[in-house]
């Protein structure tokens, strides 16, 4: 988590705080989900490894008009050191599987929680 710009704060946000807020937001999305998230929009699945934050943003940024994930998109931009725009796939090494946004969020959440439990947030 090298770049933490993009968060509305007076100073730098400690990595653990920023990651916590991302997890909290993903938890809120999964717990408050009633209708299909983002109308069942499909996004590219990603490898949850190095460069995951940029890859996640590049995948989710192609979903438009979905207010439920706008905050997540903003938060992910704070973890990605380069500007990401729709249709950009420089971090998405493998583009062979599309999944629903709801499943994408769930997979990302599970992985981030595991990183945090292991103390790997720096």
């Amino acid at each position: 988590l090298t770049c933490l710009g993009g968060f509305a704060s007076p100073g730098p946000v400690p990595p653990s705080t920023a990651l916590r807020e991302l997890i909290e937001e993903l938890v809120n999305i999964t717990q408050n989900q009633k209708a299909p998230l983002c109308n069942g929009s499909m996004v590219w699945s990603i490898n949850l490894t190095a460069g995951m934050y940029c890859a996640a943003l590049e995948s989710l940024i192609n979903v438009s008009g979905c207010s439920a994930i706008e905050k997540t998109q903003r938060m992910l931009s704070g973890f990605c050191p380069h500007k990401v725009s729709a249709g950009q796939f420089s971090s998405l090494h493998v583009r062979d599987t599309k999944i629903e946004v709801a499943q994408f969020v769930k997979d990302l959440l599970l992985h981030l929680k595991k990183l945090f439990r292991e103390g790997q947030f720096n």
Epitope: S16, E21, V27, K113, K114, R117, E118
Partner: antibody
Framework: EVQLVESGPALVKPTQTLTLTCTFS??????????VGWIRQPPGKALEWLAH???????RYNPALKSRLTISKDTSKNQVVLTMTNMDPVDTATYYC???????????????WGQGTLVTVSS | DIVMTQSPDSLAVSLGERATINCRAS??????????MNWYQQKPGQPPKLLIK???NLESGVPDRFSGSGSGTDFTLTISSLQAEDVAVYYC?????????FGQGTKVEIK
């Protein structure tokens, strides 16, 4: 109903290894976001977190005691075991096991506790 | 390590009166949405019991005379109308990072 029961020796000698077992019921350590921790309390003193283990076998230890502690689980037996090496009289305390009751699946707070077992370290 | 400091160390309150316990963390344990601060009650000879999690969320079955507040580094546990069964030692605990630490405890007695 959630229950946790600690078992182990009431008396250990200095330099010996303490092995404590937490046997629980009412929940499963194979369930996502579930975990079990150990906390101790010297007589008349405050609580000290020692270690905990998550359903997916992620283990965390108090850095001040990490070299002496090992935590493990046996999901099929509903048990969590803590070992503590090189016991010293200052380790005399009531040792509690407790279930982690997190909302988020990564932070450890403890919503159910065992009655505790008093361990005295003396020669 | 995050140091948790409770005040006062002991407190004597008349039955039916308000009891207030403070807990200060040596660094912030809050995000913009949640505070990773928990409160426990320990009666003599018993294990601790979780009262409040995430600073203000009352645990199921806990009487509503107990409440928690605060964010950042400063937190408060309030018993709005002290009952005889509330005599105990109360501990705060952060769940922000390893190692999870507890306050030294506040003993609440009847005046």
């Amino acid at each position: 109903e959630v229950q946790l029961v600690e078992s182990g020796p009431a008396l250990v000698k200095p330099t010996q290894t303490l092995t404590l077992t937490c046997t629980f019921s009412g929940f499963s350590l194979s369930t996502s976001d579930m975990g079990v921790g150990w906390i101790r309390q010297p007589p008349g003193k405050a609580l000290e977190w020692l270690a905990h283990i998550w359903w997916d076998d992620v283990k965390r230890y108090n850095p001040a005691l990490k070299s002496r502690l090992t935590i493990s689980k046996d999901t099929s037996k509903n048990q969590v075991v803590l070992t503590m090496t090189n016991m010293d009289p200052v380790d005399t305390a009531t040792y509690y096991c407790a279930r982690i009751g997190t909302n988020y699946g990564y932070d450890a707070l403890f919503d159910y506790w065992g009655q505790g077992t008093l361990v005295t370290v003396s020669s | 390590d995050i140091v948790m400091t409770q005040s006062p160390d002991s407190l004597a309150v008349s039955l039916g009166e308000r009891a207030t316990i403070n807990c200060r963390a040596s660094q912030s344990v809050s995000t913009s949405s949640y505070s990773y601060m928990n409160w426990y009650q320990q009666k003599p000879g018993q294990p601790p019991k979780l009262l409040i999690k995430y600073a203000s969320n009352l645990e199921s079955g806990v009487p509503d005379r107990f409440s928690g507040s605060g964010s950042g580094t400063d937190f408060t546990l309030t018993i709005s109308s002290l009952q005889a069964e509330d005599v105990a030692v109360y501990y705060c605990q952060h769940s922000w990072e390893i190692p999870y630490t507890f306050g030294q405890g506040t003993k609440v007695e009847i005046k």
